[in-house]
């Protein structure tokens, strides 16, 4: 969708007047909420709640609305000009490198680290080293609440170099 051209991407002489109710293409393009007909002569409205288009376009079909997965909440519904906005449920987050699913936030920080950021729908809790204040990015399964090693025993999952 990011590849769609916008009115700003068009040269000034190609820019079309933003008339939403046009039934024919303007300079070869149809307005948001529409797609072009197979003969290129008409603009056809997207179906509310089923598909959408966000930019001026010459697509022969509207884009299918996203359905929120289980584990997600719908922040806003799909309209003819905007896709559904889904967000991870409380206590879960979506990482950039695995956007296909919501993952559970950690419940605490590894030993020797302190929490400086809460769980949000788009990020896990943020932990920093108590002394240096440097962020912890590697995922460590042993969290404060679950460290059971006795004094003098190295806690191998938490053996981090600053």
């Amino acid at each position: 969708e990011s590849a769609l051209i916008t009115q700003q991407d068009l040269a000034p002489q190609q820019r079309a007047a933003p008339q939403q109710k046009r039934s024919s293409p303007s300079e070869g393009l149809c307005p948001p909420g529409h797609h072009i007909s197979e003969d290129g002569r008409d603009c056809i409205s997207c179906k509310y709640g089923q598909d959408y288009s966000t930019h001026w376009n010459d697509l022969l079909f509207c884009l299918r609305c996203t359905r929120c997965d289980s584990g997600e909440v719908e922040l806003s519904p799909c309209t003819t000009t905007r896709n559904t906005v889904c967000q991870c449920e409380e206590g879960t987050f979506r990482e950039e490198d695995s956007p296909e699913m919501c993952r559970k936030c950690r419940t605490g920080c590894p030993r020797g680290m302190v929490k400086v950021g809460d769980c949000t729908p788009w990020s896990d809790i943020e932990c920093v080293h108590k002394e240096s204040g440097t962020k912890h990015s590697g995922e460590v399964p042993a969290v404060e609440e679950t460290v059971t090693s006795s004094p003098g025993t190295p806690a191998s999952p938490c053996s981090l170099s600053g």
Epitope: A3, I36, E38, D39, G40, D58, L59, L60
Partner: antibody
Framework: SVEESGGRLVTPGTPLTLTCTVS????????MIWVRQAPGEGLEYIGF?????SAYYASWAKGRFTISKTSTTVDLKMTSPTTEDTATYFC???????????WGPGTLVTVSS | DIVMTQTPASVSEPVGGTVTIKCQAS??????LSWYQQKPGQPPKRLIY???TLASGVPSRFKGSGSGTDFTLTIRDLECADAATYYC????????????FGGGTEVVVK
């Protein structure tokens, strides 16, 4: 039918305009597309012009080519050709859902110093 | 711009054999894809449009299928005349996404 003309040997930097002449249909009702093919290479989309004369280009072709049309011809202007622009240039009729259905034989452009 | 990835680059089959060419789009184009045949020194010729509709005069040995991002051109009962390079091209949103052709597949008939 569709026929291209204007292809010739030019030196780098010399602007060149290729012309596509159509007969048997009205270009006021069709989009027209320009495609090129370097010797021994594949087809490369340059851009197209809609029935109402709006031109759109492949991202690599913006600024290097200008497409315009009259009532019976479609022009492709090469603004400042380089040796990499040596190719056979095709003009064709484009229909939105049915693809590029009517092609010209092509015209050869050689850019060399 | 949309990117069309075509495989294989070259294929060799005997007369009477079957060739399968695949084309993958970098984003969904529904069924709006065309296939072209090009012989040396000639312009391309449209074989198939809307992914599976045969153009006028094209023998039924040519078959197109697929939708969304994955498409296939199958040529069965190969004839010597089928030796050519084949290209795919998207037909939805060429102002929006561009209309880049696939890289081409050379079909050699033995």
């Amino acid at each position: 039918s569709v026929e291209e003309s204007g292809g010739r040997l030019v030196t780098p930097g010399t602007p060149l305009t290729l012309t596509c002449t159509v007969s048997g249909f009205s270009i006021s009702r069709y989009a027209m597309i320009w495609v090129r093919q370097a010797p021994g290479e594949g087809l490369e989309y340059i851009g197209f012009i809609t029935s109402d004369s709006s031109a759109y280009y492949a991202s690599w072709a913006k600024g290097r080519f200008t497409i315009s049309k009259t009532s019976t011809t479609v022009d492709l202007k090469m603004t400042s050709p380089t040796t990499e622009d040596t190719a056979t240039y095709f003009c064709a009729r484009y229909t939105y859902s049915d693809g590029t259905d009517l092609w010209g034989p092509g015209t050869l452009v050689t850019v060399s110093s | 711009d949309i990117v069309m990835t075509q495989t294989p680059a070259s294929v060799s089959e005997p007369v009477g054999g079957t060739v399968t060419i695949k084309c993958q789009a970098s984003q969904s184009i529904s069924t709006y894809l065309s296939w072209y045949q090009q012989k040396p020194g000639q312009p391309p010729k449209r074989l198939i449009y809307k992914a599976s509709t045969l153009a006028s005069g094209v023998p039924s040995r040519f078959k197109g299928s697929g939708s969304g991002t994955d498409f296939t051109l199958t040529i069965r009962d190969l004839e010597c005349a089928d030796a050519a390079t084949y290209y795919c091209q998207p037909n939805s949103g060429i102002a929006t996404y561009g209309a880049a052709f696939g890289g081409g597949t050379e079909v050699v008939v033995k």
